[in-house]
Interface confidence: medium
Amino acid sequence: AFGISGVQKYTRALHDSSITGISPITEYLASLSTYNDQSITFALEDESYEIYVEDLKKDEKKDKVLLSYYESQHPSNESGDGVDGKMLMVTLSPTKDFWLHANNKEHSVELHKCEKPLPDQAFFVLHNMHSNCVSFECKTDPGVFIGVKDNHLALIKVDSSENLCTENILFKLSET
């Protein structure tokens, strides 16, 4: 995985370039869970979606998220998360026309209905961490990651490379 300086450098580079008009290189339908195996779930309420972090029983169906993968157009100088020297970014959509968005003002993660091209707030730099975990860094705010806080998703500032492996910003992707 990248050190934090590398993360910030590439995110800044990405911030300077627009990728919103580019088609995804691949898509992957997966359930999303925390490092501690709590499930990320989505519920429709009053015509909007709420995001939850829940303990689910074995027979309770996990919600799926469509991850669309994009390549940055900036070559990588460091090894780690790059694909052929490029950074991977993702958008996350739990249901048609809704995408996870970073609300940097409120330090929150929200689901917004929107049309393509998607805004920058819907893009996250994908980092492959240890133990088959990933983390999601805001395209719009270098060093800020999707994390778990008080049983909700929130934006969490990571200010050192050691904190990149903090459990509350690590997520697992599973096809089941």
Epitope: T41, A43, E45, Y52, E54, D55, L56, K57, K58, D59, E60, K61
Partner: antibody, heavy 121, light 107 residues
């Protein structure tokens, strides 16, 4: 930690009404169906009423249909059971239990401690 | 309505012994069966769901099996805290129904 705490049980006369409450915590209440189950002293368990996570649909056995009404307040994480036209055979400990998650799963992973309703003149 | 017949109604056993409780449905319930334990203070705990899935935190000496109309709960080696009432429940079809219960007592 998941908790369900029932209250409202009392001694009431036949024909009268009583309302039970179940305050919940430790899980996302509005994502789960909820159920009331009762147990006559020294006897077995009987399903009494169920309600969907939104409150949009309710289910009852014939023994209480038309007399009991299950409801919920998702903003307060609270389940209710309104019991009208009470009969002596309604004397029981009433338990609330967390039912299925809105789209899947099996019921009754968690139960309250119960509240005793005694119907007697 | 689906009837659940639980047997035996009372079971006397010794510590360390293996015991099995049976639950028979009046029609197929497709593994939609739960086993509960009720302690003397009234506390109810789910042990097994989907006929054979062990609830997290429940000791592995408990196991459930069965299909169609015939189901069973087994305890491989009885411990003192296992002496209690046991109930099965079918949740295949409304109205959901419970078995009559089995009282497991110390011989």
């Amino acid at each position: 930690e998941v908790q369900l705490v029932e209250s409202g049980g009392d001694l009431v006369q036949p024909g009268r009404s009583l309302k039970l409450s179940c305050v919940t915590s430790g899980f996302i209440f509005k994502n789960y169906w909820m159920t009331w189950i009762r147990q006559v002293p020294g006897k077995g368990l009987e399903w009494v009423a169920s309600i969907t996570n939104t409150g949009g649909a309710t289910y009852y056995p014939d023994s209480v249909k038309g007399r009991f009404t299950i409801s919920r307040d998702n903003s307060e994480n609270t389940l209710y059971l309104q019991m009208n036209s009470l009969r002596s055979e309604d004397t029981a400990t009433y338990y609330c239990a967390r039912d299925r998650r809105y789209n899947s799963g099996s019921p009754f992973a968690y139960w309250g401690q119960g509240t005793l309703v005694t119907v007697s003149s | 309505d689906i009837q659940l017949t639980q047997s035996p109604s009372t079971l006397a056993a010794s510590l360390g012994e293996r015991v099995t409780i049976s639950c028979r449905a009046s029609q197929s319930i497709s593994n939609s069966l739960i086993w509960f334990q009720q302690k003397p203070d009234g506390t109810i705990k789910r042990l097994i769901y989907s006929s054979s899935t062990l609830e997290s935190g429940v000791p592995s000496r408990f196991s459930g099996s069965g299909s169609g109309t015939d189901y069973s709960l087994s305890i491989s080696s009885l411990e003192s805290e296992d002496f209690a009432m046991y109930y099965c429940l079918q949740y295949a079809t409304y109205p959901w129904t419970f078995g009559g219960g089995t009282k497991l007592e110390l011989r």
